[in-house]
């Protein structure tokens, strides 16, 4: 088989147009995912066969494999056939579709498999990830194909950034079938223990009646060892239970405990580990930051979150301006401390449509007979702006004034415009910027005021218009970073009579 | 912990249908894909089709659309495979998966043997 343009990679523009040949002895086919795109065949005087496929307006979805093959192999000694791989870079298309088949993809022992994103630039940077992580995986990669190697049981996707935005594949599921005729768990009553406290651990089989126990555990390893106890649960299907107890643990107590499991019928086995660590004394450790200046919005409602690890559980308290905080009745605050895991706790304080005397120095406390966590933060109580006032005046000095005040925190921005054309205005013509160039016939000034009892701004700002000849909308926008407010007014010259 | 429960062993004759049935718990039902995978005797995984019940639309693989039919009952959370058409090469053990993102939950597999 001879194919033009030899390939066996090419790189054509999106749009173009594109002619693949093939020639063979015998009659030739082009294949494209399994079907024959309509293509041209001919058989030459000399008794060659060929076949002509014309991509015409080429997009991205046109990257991928083209084979040409024997169109009749019978007689034919080869299974001869030429694989071609064309990209077609387009922007508009990140990763190339895949089916369903592709996007799950199961195992029953360890394996190289391939998770098949595949974009059609081979020039993109593209990398892997656990769907719920965000570091790259080291895997390689093949443009064609995606990411080979051995994969574990998770769920994957592929990134890359195309200009500046950044595209993510489908997910991909690895879905590895654990072949065993024996289930075994372990687990522990507690995997964090003080020292002088105890550790139990249990290790179930399910649905199998013989079966033999071996436990390593860090003990054994400097040759003390305990008798673990075995149980029947008789349960349906059949449980067996062994229970290793250690009375009063060290710090050499700490490691990997592991239970082997052997079924000597069949000459199966299976083993789970557990890790348990044995602390000298409690603890209790913030895990992520919080910053030392929260806000929320006035009338919403706000819930402040800190997260923590402790062992044994600890009492949380929180605390306003030092005072202890509790459920109110009112349904004003709500505290809430859950565990998520054995060690790990959620602290939430809830703020019910907040108001603005909830403002202040916080501090959540968590605390047991070994140690102690505090973590304090302000609550800055964020006020949407609104203009209060918007008023015109104009003075004997001939100039007119026009005065805009409002308020809001944090400290609001003014800004004033005006359109002169007032049936075109504001819908056709843009409004334009007042005060803040000299060219305008405009002066401004602006006073902030901060009202402690509110904790709120009130700005105050005056627009002193020089020659008003014609009607004239002035508007005034306030803003800060929940919103925003905007009054206008109508100003006329001094030689109209009316308003 | 998410669990999957199938129904037990079936014996049918070529030519005949067979319903599995697959009963989960420990997770919200509608949330997760459920998969229909099989391993015949000495084969690998093969993958059948699946369904999120939420969406309820199965997917199926081209080989099985036609002879399969998968649906989820949302009020026993419960996801149903149908074959039809059996033949002696549909003898497997069928299974039901799910994945939860870190990890896949099987259930513990259904032997179908087709023999007439």
């Known amino acids: 088989l001879v194919v033009t343009p030899p390939g066996p990679e090419l790189v054509l523009n999106v749009s173009s147009t594109f002619v693949l040949t093939c020639s063979g002895s015998a009659p030739v086919v082009w294949e494209r995912m399994s079907q024959e795109p309509p293509q041209e065949m001919a058989k030459a005087q000399d008794g060659t066969f060929s076949s002509v496929l014309t991509l015409t307006n080429l997009t991205g979805l046109d990257t991928g494999e083209y084979f040409c093959t024997h169109n009749d192999s019978r007689g034919l000694e080869t299974d001869e056939r030429k694989r071609l791989y064309i990209f077609v870079p387009d922007p508009t298309v990140g990763f190339l579709p895949n089916d369903a088949e592709e996007l799950f993809i199961f195992l029953t022992e360890i394996t190289e498999i391939t998770i098949p994103c595949r974009v059609t630039d081979p020039q993109l940077v593209v990398t892997l990830h656990e769907k719920k992580g965000d570091v790259a995986l080291p895997v390689p990669y093949d443009h064609q194909r995606g990411f080979s190697g051995i994969f574990e049981d998770r769920s994957y996707i592929c990134k890359t950034t195309i200009g500046d935005r950044e595209v993510d594949s489908d997910a991909y599921y690895v879905y590895r079938l654990q072949v065993s005729s024996i289930n075994v768990s372990v687990n522990a009553v507690q995997t964090v223990v003080r020292q002088g406290e105890n550790i139990t651990l249990m290790c179930i089989v399910i649905g199998n009646e013989v079966v033999n126990f071996e436990w390593t555990y860090p003990r054994k390893e400097s040759g003390r060892l305990v008798e673990p106890v075995t149980d029947f649960l008789l349960d349906m299907p059949y449980h067996i239970r062994s229970i290793l107890h250690i009375p009063s643990a060290e710090l050499e107590d700490s490691g990997t405990y592991t239970c082997n499991v052997t079924e000597s019928v069949n000459d199966h086995q299976d083993e789970k580990a557990i890790n348990i660590t044995v602390v000298e004394s409690g603890y209790v450790r913030l895990l992520g930051e919080v910053g030392t200046l929260q806000f929320a919005e006035l009338h919403r409602s706000r819930t402040l979150q800190v997260v923590f690890e402790a062992y044994p559980p600890p009492t949380v308290l929180w605390f306003k301006d030092n005072r202890t905080l509790g459920d109110s009745s009112a349904g004003e605050i709500a505290l809430s401390t859950r565990n998520v895991s054995e060690t790990r706790y959620v602290s939430e304080l809830t703020l019910v449509r907040v108001k603005v005397a909830e403002a202040g120095h916080y501090t959540m406390r968590a605390f047991h007979e070994d140690a102690e966590v505090q973590l304090s933060f302000q609550l800055q109580i964020n006020v949407p702006v609104r203009v209060l006032e918007l008023s015109e005046s104009h003075p004997d000095s001939g100039e007119q004034t026009v005065r805009c005040r409002g308020r809001g925190m944090p400290q609001p921005n003014i800004i004033w415009s005006a359109c002169r054309d007032l049936k075109r205005c504001p819908r056709e013509l843009p409004p334009t910027l007042l005060g803040n160039s000299s060219e305008e016939e405009s002066q401004l000034e602006t006073n902030v005021t901060y009202w402690e009892e509110e904790q709120e701004f009130e700005v105050v700002s005056t627009l002193r218009l020089q020659h008003v000849d014609r009607p004239l909308s002035v508007r005034c926008t306030l803003r800060n970073a929940v919103g925003q407010d905007t009054q206008e007014v109508i100003v006329v010259p001094h030689s109209l009579p009316f308003k | 912990q998410m669990q999957l429960v199938q129904s037990g062993a079936e014996v049918k004759k070529p030519g005949a249908s067979v319903k599995v049935s697959c009963k989960a718990s420990?997770?919200?039902?509608?949330?997760?894909?459920i998969q229909w995978v099989r391993q015949a005797p000495g084969q690998g995984l093969e993958w059948i089709g699946g369904?999120?019940?939420?969406?309820?639309?199965?997917n199926y693989a081209q080989r099985f659309q036609g002879r399969v039919t998968i649906n989820a009952d949302e009020s026993t959370s419960t996801v149903y495979m149908e074959m039809s058409s059996l033949r002696s090469e549909d003898t497997a053990v069928y299974y039901c998966?799910?994945?939860?993102?870190?990890?896949?939950?099987w259930g513990q597999g259904t032997l179908v043997t087709v023999s007439s």
């Open positions: 420990g997770y919200t039902f509608t949330d997760y894909y």
């Open positions: 998966a799910t994945h939860g993102g870190d990890r896949s939950y």
């Open positions: 369904i999120l019940p939420i969406l309820k639309t199965p």
